[in-house]
Interface confidence: low
């Protein structure tokens, strides 16, 4: 648990600036398993090693993310780094954990937040915790206060969703991360529905 993620991060942090750029470019064209979305180019090119690791894990889960990282590193001629990841994969049994259905299939079905709008409005109860996580980074002070001013959880979530149309993928990812932190079971239920 977590070894694959750490291994991906270690590998990416070992890349020089130019190598990391090359890694990202190859990631934009690498053949993906069916059903997996591609990380959007605009967001991808801005990412540092840590952001990219998180994004690989969020889009492809640990096992496939590890495999994909190995593929790209090999394609770049960085066999030694790829072999280190292969060792991690074997040690952690990551192959067995490979998911047949992606957690976030952006290309085919839209973002989780858009897909599950009604369910989130109905079922998220700890809205204030979600707001705190988004305050400043996604929500302005005015938006934060406007949502908090609503009385019920459902009304707060409706108000929050009224701002979503203007959000980019990063903002939606931030909301998803906050939901994962505060309502993990709910998100798991919706992911599997």
């Amino acid at each position: 648990m977590g070894r694959a993620r750490d291994a991906i991060l270690d590998a990416l942090e070992n890349l020089s600036g130019d190598e990391l750029k090359k890694f990202k470019m190859k990631l934009l064209t690498v053949q993906l398993r069916e059903g997996y979305g591609r990380i959007p180019r605009g967001a991808l090119l801005q990412m540092d090693a840590i952001d990219l690791t998180d994004k690989l894990v969020s889009y492809y889960l640990e096992s496939y993310g590890l495999e994909l990282t190995m593929t790209v590193l090999r394609d770049m001629g960085l066999q030694e780094l790829a072999e280190q990841l292969q060792t991690t994969k074997e040690e952690s049994g990551a192959v067995a954990a490979a998911a047949s259905v992606p957690a976030q299939s952006t290309a085919r079905t839209g973002h989780f937040v858009d897909q599950h709008r009604q369910a989130l409005i109905a079922r998220v109860t700890e809205v204030d915790g979600v707001l705190d996580a988004l305050h400043g980074s996604v929500l302005t002070e005015g938006q934060y206060q406007a949502v908090r001013a609503e009385t019920t959880s459902q009304d707060k979530m409706r108000k929050l969703f009224s701002f979503v149309p203007s959000w980019n993928l990063t903002c939606k990812d931030s909301l998803l991360q906050a939901l994962k932190e505060i309502h993990p079971y709910l998100v798991m239920d919706l992911e599997q529905s």
Partner: antibody, heavy 124, light 107 residues
Framework: QVQLQQSGAELARPGASVKLSCKAS????????INWVKQRTGQGLEWIGK????????HNNENFKGKATLTADTSSSTAYMDLRSLTSEDSAVYFC?????????????????WGTGTTVTVSS | DIKMTQSPSSMYASLGERVTITCKAS??????LSWYQQKPWKSPKTLIY???SLADGVPSRFSGSGSGQDYSLTISSLESDDTATYYC?????????FGSGTKLEIK
Amino acid sequence: QVQLQQSGAELARPGASVKLSCKASGYNFTTYGINWVKQRTGQGLEWIGKIYPRSGNTHNNENFKGKATLTADTSSSTAYMDLRSLTSEDSAVYFCARSPYAFYSSSYWYFDVWGTGTTVTVSS
Amino acid sequence: DIKMTQSPSSMYASLGERVTITCKASQDIKSYLSWYQQKPWKSPKTLIYYATSLADGVPSRFSGSGSGQDYSLTISSLESDDTATYYCLQHGESPFTFGSGTKLEIK
């Protein structure tokens, strides 16, 4: 090796505040969460809250809202907890503990490394 | 909040004996459970995470099992160094909650 070194014991008056620190070493501070846990003498463990140092996002146990404020300084790889309006109920040992975490799995929120602990005594 | 009911609260066992401690969650916690060992005046130490995974450096005599609401920690053959208090923790839903602890002593 991975270590979480906590600040020394604190003696405080009722109503005062204290700031406890937890200095991380041996790993990348920004890629793990830091939790805080309270243990009163002879009692069990109680989760106070957690912080993601990279973003500064925090999640507190409702029982500690208004009591504990969690912050982190990535430049010094140090997490902090402010305890305010102290009463005798706050006399306890406070531990920080590291959590591996990832975007898509709460299974990473277990505590894999624990700090050395800080004893807080509130007395007039 | 999810309540974790741990039992027994204390127990005595002989060296070499098989020991089992249990934790019951008030709802399904989907294996988001870990176990910790704490000796007097020391910090807790991580034994098991995600219900069944052995933490680094922990002897193989420790094992975890369970799913849904019911979980257990087993020490296959008790050693003198295992005298301690053991806690379970659910880490699937905020706020995270610990069991009340099991104090294990040698007969």
